[in-house]
């Protein structure tokens, strides 16, 4: 009797889609999997025969419930299927977005990328998939642990007003109202603000 | 029963243009996104590009960028390929598809409806 594939999971970020799983313990060799997905009421094959522990799922619809299934075989022996289901649009999770930050004076200027979608055309992005995208900002100086949020209107945001020659850390992710969701959040990026701009009477 | 048609293909010489068209019958073009897909002799379906209907917004493949533009004309349910500077690489059976989500643009998975296609030879 062939165990089945353990720990089956849907891995998805930004719709790169993978189906991973661990191979179970068995003592007569070596494993391979295959993993399928049901389509019109019909498994096709995705990943066949496979010594690989994941499959790329990238190019399923995002729309929709999606039946899933991974088993092991050995020889002329295989496992009974693992299931899962997966709705790409409701389960990927949202990626960290990108973030161009340039100091001006006593002013951070804050410029926001969405996420880059697998299988898509570059300039398709999570904003296009997401009606509702939006950016969530938190800033704070560096050294203390208050943090300021904000939610920008728009791909850019300028915070004004900072405190002269002092660093001040920002990270952004991506925020979607209408499901309450709210994705990675970007890695710290920490600049140091020059003199400020008024002038003294 | 939505029914996409293509028109406008044909044989044209390279560096030539063509502008295919993708009229809705049956229902409005009322979709959130329209797709142009080709399949060139012998390979798989590819994406060209597509046009959100939300924002208006396009999208294109980086073997046709600054050729060809998408477009569409609402009051004739109809969306426009404009192909120029074109190449014998183009030559192919090109496709438009109907997206009832508009989630996607470049996967054939993401689109519902799809019309039966249009020829288009480029070739001196």
């Known amino acids: 009797m062939v165990p089945p594939p353990e720990n089956v999971r849907m891995n998805s970020v930004n719709f790169k889609n993978i189906l991973q799983w661990e191979s179970p313990a068995f003592a007569k060799g070596n494993l391979t999997f295959t993993a399928q997905y049901l389509s019109y009421r019909i498994f096709q094959d995705k990943c066949m025969n496979t010594t690989l522990t994941e499959c790329d799922f990238s190019s399923l619809s995002k729309y929709g419930d999606h039946t899933l299934r991974v088993r092991a075989e050995f020889a002329d022996e295989h496992s009974d299927w693992v299931n899962i289901t997966f709705c790409p649009v409701d389960d990927t999770i949202i990626g960290p977005p990108g973030m161009q930050v340039e100091v001006l004076a006593d002013s951070l200027h804050m410029r926001f990328l969405a996420p880059k979608i697998e299988n898509e055309y570059e300039t398709w992005t999570m904003k296009n998939v997401y009606n509702s995208w939006t950016y969530n900002v938190q800033y704070w100086k560096n050294g203390t642990d208050e943090k300021f949020q904000i939610t920008p209107q728009y791909d850019f945001e300028v915070l004004r007003n900072l405190e002269p020659w002092t660093t001040y850390c920002v990270q952004v992710r991506g925020f979607l109202p209408d499901r309450n969701k709210a994705g990675e959040w970007s890695e710290p990026v920490c600049e140091q603000t020059t003199h400020d701009e008024t002038v003294p009477s | 029963e939505v029914q996409l048609v293509e028109s406008g293909g044909g044989l044209v010489q390279p560096g030539g243009s063509l502008r295919l068209s993708c009229a809705a019958s049956g229902n409005s073009l009322d979709y959130p996104t329209i797709g142009w897909f080709r399949q060139a002799p012998g390979k798989g379906l590819e994406g060209v590009s597509c046009i959100s209907a939300s924002e208006g917004s396009t999208h294109y493949a980086d073997a046709v960028k600054g050729r060809f533009t998408i477009s569409r004309d609402n009051s004739k349910n109809t969306v426009y390929l404009q192909m120029n500077s074109l190449r014998a690489e183009d030559t192919a059976v090109y496709y438009c598809?109907?997206?009832?989500?508009?989630?996607?643009?470049?996967?054939?998975?993401?689109?519902?409806?799809w019309g039966q296609g249009t020829m288009v030879t480029v070739s001196s």
């Open positions: 598809a109907a997206s009832l989500h508009g989630l996607g643009c470049k996967s054939e998975a993401d689109y519902d409806y």
